[in-house]
């Protein structure tokens, strides 16, 4: 189960000349409003047809009056969204017409009049759950452009509306075999409870054990696909496995129809009707326009209605191919520059940046040092984002802040004792050692294994180091 | 208001080839869709190539291999290659750029194809 939703920008003149007069005037002011009607599947059927989808009428729109002599501009429209809930899955392919109607408000007798403006009609491909598509449609000289989505009503969820969503019983993770439902990440997806082989993709189900099929497959699971060819002739009964069963010869045998088209009978021949994307007598010429929905995830088609014109689709961000059908991974293209985190937020593209820069791209790195004082004589260095003091003699800390004990890091070896000095360290050495860290033995025939000591110091002395 | 110009429009032989450009204009940008279409006269308006915004092209079943589609984003330009031209190609061939909002038009250039 779930919801189409209409939401209707803006009604008035299209491109061109001819510009069509304003359906209002000063003596006869008038509002309007809007009705959609939905049926599944990409079928041609008259307007009369039932909305098999669901339909719906929008609020009447504030009263227009027109300015004498003023074009007909767009005009004022009705508030919110129109929606249309459907109870079963979403076909993921349908037809709609949009219609527009002005209600009369002159003084006529027995109440407002009503009138049908315009009409469009139009075959889509969408799916549940994905965004908003933006369409324009021409009616003569009306232009109307809106935008429409599918979405899901919990726990339904899916292209088709078909899976379920439960709560998690578990805090951390789904039950074995189940999926976090996405973008419910505290939902698990609920187990399948259809009948047992029930088609996955011509099949859904409400109720346990259940297998319904959606338009164009039939049988106890909805693998049969249905055909149009003489079933319902009196030569034969239908069968389940291939949904027709003719024993005598006619028109439709070996079935003349190409590129997948279904045959009918007619009084004097057959008559094929072609899958999307195919025309002819047998179906034989391929040409995909407008009308066919060719376009993905929200593509505006721009094309001719001739079968020989023609289409290419106006994609929205984050999707490419000729239909739009392709999610751009645009973080592989690796955009946020220094180490910064990208995400595809699907409308957008975001980095992250580590700190020290900024910008979209994390492309700007910011002065580390800008602002940053170093206590006590110590000097800023840049680098990776951070900055860093390095500090004067005596000093330590992020900031320099910190007296260092100089002692801390125990330099003075073999025993030595550390003293610490306004200019660094002195290491007072154990008999035997000598040098700024005590580090050379001293020989027992009193000489030193490196450099001998300065004059007027006894090895064992105190050195200063500086 | 910008506006798409055409040039390139001419006669030419059976047989022979043309190259249409439409630009360069502040118009035509990689984020737009573009287009050429054709009328003739008496018949309504059709797309004959088109690139779109993430670069993918079509043609008019009339005119697979004969005629290519090209854009030049430095330039702001999009041309149309046009070779081994038919009779039936004769008409006004209107160059067109979109995006989600607008859509652009050009005033047309006239191709005609006769012995």
């Known amino acids: 189960a779930g919801v189409f939703e209409l939401q209707i920008h803006s009604f008035g003149p299209g491109p061109g000349p001819g510009a069509p007069r304003s359906p209002c005037s000063a003596r006869l002011p008038c509002r309007l409003f809007f009705r959609v009607c939905l049926k599944p599947g990409l079928s041609e059927e008259a307007a009369e047809s039932p909305c098999a989808l669901g339909a719906a009428l929008s609020a009447r729109g504030p009263v227009y009056t027109e300015q004498p002599g003023a074009p007909a501009p767009d005009l004022p429209l009705p508030d919110g969204l129109l929606q249309v809930p459907f109870r079963d899955a979403w076909p993921g392919t349908f037809s709609f017409i949009i219609e527009t109607w002005r209600e009369e408000l002159g003084d006529q007798i027995g109440g407002p009049a009503w009138s049908l403006l315009a009409r469009v009609a139009g075959r889509r491909r969408l799916a549940a759950g994905g965004p908003w598509a933006r369409d324009i449609q021409r009616a003569g000289a009306w232009e109307l452009r809106f935008s429409y989505r599918a979405r899901c009503e919990p726990p339904a969820v899916g292209t088709a509306c078909t899976r379920l969503c439960r709560p998690r019983s578990a805090p951390s993770r789904c039950g074995p075999g189940l999926r976090p439902c996405a973008p419910l990440e505290d939902e698990c997806e609920a187990p399948l409870v259809c009948r047992a082989g029930c088609s996955p993709e011509h099949g859904f189900c409400e109720q346990p054990g259940e297998c319904r099929c959606l338009e164009g497959w039939t049988g106890p699971l909805c693998t049969v696909p249905v055909s149009t060819s003489s079933c319902l002739s009196p030569r034969g009964p239908s069968s389940a496995t291939t949904g027709c069963l003719v024993p005598g010869p006619g028109p439709c045998d070996g079935n003349p129809c190409a590129n997948g088209g279904s045959c009918s009978e007619t009084p004097r021949s057959f008559e094929c009707t072609c899958p999307r994307g195919f025309y002819g007598l047998r179906c034989e010429v391929s040409g995909v326009t407008c009308a066919d929905g060719p376009c993905f995830n929200g593509g505006l088609c721009v094309g001719g209605a001739d079968p020989d014109s023609a289409y290419i689709c106006h994609c929205p961000p984050g999707f490419q191919g000729s239909n739009c059908e392709k999610r751009v991974d645009r973080c592989s293209l690796q955009p946020c520059r220094n180490g910064g985190l990208c995400l595809d937020l699907g409308h957008a593209l975001r980095c992250r940046c580590r700190a020290g820069f900024a910008g979209p791209r994390c492309e700007h790195d910011l002065d580390d040092c800008a602002g940053r004082a170093c206590a006590n004589g110590g000097t800023c260095v840049e680098g990776g984002g951070a900055h860093r003091c390095s500090c004067a003699l005596g000093f330590g800390g992020r900031d320099c802040r910190e007296r260092a004990d100089p002692c801390a890091a125990r330099p003075c070896a073999h025993g030595g004792r550390c003293y610490a000095h306004f200019s660094g360290l002195v290491c007072a050495c154990a008999p035997g050692y000598m040098g700024a860290r005590c580090e050379f033995p001293v020989h027992p025939d009193g000489a030193s294994a490196l450099p001998a000591a300065p004059p007027g110091l006894r090895p064992g002395d105190p050195q200063r180091y500086l | 208001e910008v506006q798409l110009v055409e040039s390139g429009g001419g006669e030419v032989q059976p047989g022979g080839s043309l190259r249409l450009s439409c630009g360069p204009s502040?118009?035509?940008?990689?984020?737009?869709?573009m287009g050429w279409w054709r009328q003739a006269p008496g018949k309504q308006r059709n797309l004959v190539a088109g690139?779109?915004?993430?670069?993918?092209?079509n043609y008019a079943q009339s005119v697979k291999g004969r005629f290519t589609i090209s854009r030049d984003n430095a330039k702001n330009t999009v041309y149309l290659q046009m070779s081994s031209l038919r009779a039936e190609d004769t008409a006004v061939y209107y160059c067109?750029?979109?995006?989600?909002?607008?859509?652009?038009w050009g005033q047309g250039t006239l191709v005609t194809v006769k012995p």
């Open positions: 067109y750029a979109r995006d989600f909002e607008n859509e652009y």
């Open positions: 502040e118009i035509i940008t990689s984020d737009k869709s």
């Open positions: 690139i779109s915004n993430v670069g993918s092209t």
